[in-house]
C-alpha cells in the first residue's frame, strides 16, 4: 500500500521518457475485451470511428487490434535505475492509419487518423496488474488509464496503488 504518492512515484518520469528506436520491438494482433469479457468493438459512423464496449452475440466475430510494442527508456536521474529503467509502451490500431488516442481534456479515448511519427497521445504504458490482464496508462498523463465507463472507453484517474486493480481498467488480450 503506497497511497497516492506511490502511484506518482511509479509514473513520475513518464513525461520525460523517450522511446528508443522508431520501429516497434514487436507487434501483436489481438482482440481486446474487458475484465468482465465484454468486447471492445469499432464501428465506422459518419466517416469517423466510434468505440463500443458490448456483449457480442454467440458467433459474432471479435474486432482485432494491432498492438505495437515500443521500448521506452527512463532518464537515469529520474528512475534511479541508470540505463536499466525500461518501460513498454504500446500503440493500438484497430484499422489501417487509425490509432487510439487519449484526449486528456475530455477524459475520453478516441480513434484518430494520423501519420507516423505518432503523437504522444497515442502511446500507453503497458501494466500487468494481473497475470492475464493488462492496463494502459497514458504517456501524456501519468496516473490516468484507459477504462470502461457507461459502455464506452474513457480515461480514468487512478489515485492509489490499491485502485490499480479495479476491474474497469483491466483488459484481456486474446488471439481468438
Amino acid at each position: 500500500a503506497f497511497g497516492i504518492s506511490g502511484v506518482q512515484k511509479y509514473t513520475r518520469a513518464l513525461h520525460d521518457s523517450s522511446i528508443t528506436g522508431i520501429s516497434p520491438i514487436t507487434e501483436y494482433l489481438a482482440s481486446l475485451s474487458t475484465y468482465n469479457d465484454q468486447s471492445i468493438t469499432f464501428a465506422l459512423e459518419d466517416e469517423s470511428y466510434e468505440i463500443y464496449v458490448e456483449d457480442l452475440k454467440k458467433d459474432e466475430k471479435k474486432d482485432k487490434v494491432l498492438l505495437s510494442y515500443y521500448e521506452s527508456q527512463h532518464p537515469s536521474n529520474e528512475s534511479g535505475d541508470g540505463v536499466d529503467g525500461k518501460m513498454l509502451m504500446v500503440t493500438l490500431s484497430p484499422t489501417k492509419d487509425f490509432w487510439l488516442h487519449a484526449n486528456n481534456k475530455e477524459h475520453s479515448v478516441e480513434l484518430h487518423k494520423c501519420e507516423k511519427p505518432l503523437p504522444d497521445q497515442a502511446f500507453f504504458v503497458l501494466h500487468n496488474m494481473h497475470s492475464n490482464c493488462v492496463s494502459f496508462e497514458c504517456k501524456t498523463d501519468p496516473g490516468v488509464f484507459i477504462g470502461v465507463k457507461d459502455n464506452h472507453l474513457a480515461l480514468i484517474k487512478v489515485d492509489s496503488s490499491e485502485n490499480l486493480c479495479t476491474e474497469n481498467i483491466l483488459f484481456k488480450l486474446s488471439e481468438t
Partner: antibody
Amino acid sequence: EVQLVESGGGLVQPGGSLRLSCAASGFTFNNYWMTWVRQAPGKGLEWVASITYTGGGTYYPDSVKGRFTISRDNAKSSLYLQMNSLRAEDTAVYYCTRANYYYNTYGGFPYWGQGTLVTVSS
Amino acid sequence: DIQMTQSPSSLSASVGDRVTITCLASEGFSNDLAWYQQKPGKSPKLLIYAASRLQDGVPSRFSGSGSGTDFTLTISSLQPEDFATYFCQQGSKYPLTFGGGTKVEIK
C-alpha cells in the same frame, strides 16, 4: 549495478518449513514484478512464484500452490518465499529474478541472484 | 499449460560452427519467448527476449527467430565461451514454462 542476493536456504526435513529472502539493490524495486525460479540438481529450470510490482497479485504453478507463499516488502526492497509442507522434490537451488520492464511481465528475466540451495531430506 | 519442447537435448560442435537450437510450443502464443545460457554452477543469463531481441551486452553472434509455436536460437560462429546449456522460456501464459534445455558440448 543491479544486485539480487538470496538467503535462507538450508537442510530441512520433509514436512518442514523454510523462508527464503532476496535483498534487491541498484534499481527501483517497487516498479518491477519479481519471480522465484528453481533448479533441482542436474535438472532444468522451473517457475515457482511471481508477484506483481505492487504486491497485490501472486501466482503459482500447481506443484507449489497452497504450500508456498511469495511476498514482498517494497519499503525494504526485499522479496520472500515462505515454503511450508516441504517435500523431497522441492530440493533445488532457488533463484530470485527480476522482470525486464517496469510494471509488467514481458521480456524474460534479465537479472538473477546467485541462488540459495534448499535440501529437503530426513 | 504450454509445454516447451527443446531439441536437441544435447549436441557436440566445434569452435566456429553454426549451431541451431529449436523450441516447439504445444500451442501458439505471442512472441514473449526468451532464451537463456547457463554454465555449471552459475545463474542463467538472458540472451534473447521477445523471440528475437538481443539483450544488452550479448554478442551479436546470438540471434533468435520464430513465432507462434516454433522458435529458434542460432549461434552463428560458436566460441569457446559458448559451451553451456541453453533454455527457452515462454512468458505469454501462466504457468510460465521452460524448455528442458540443450547442452552444447565440445566435439
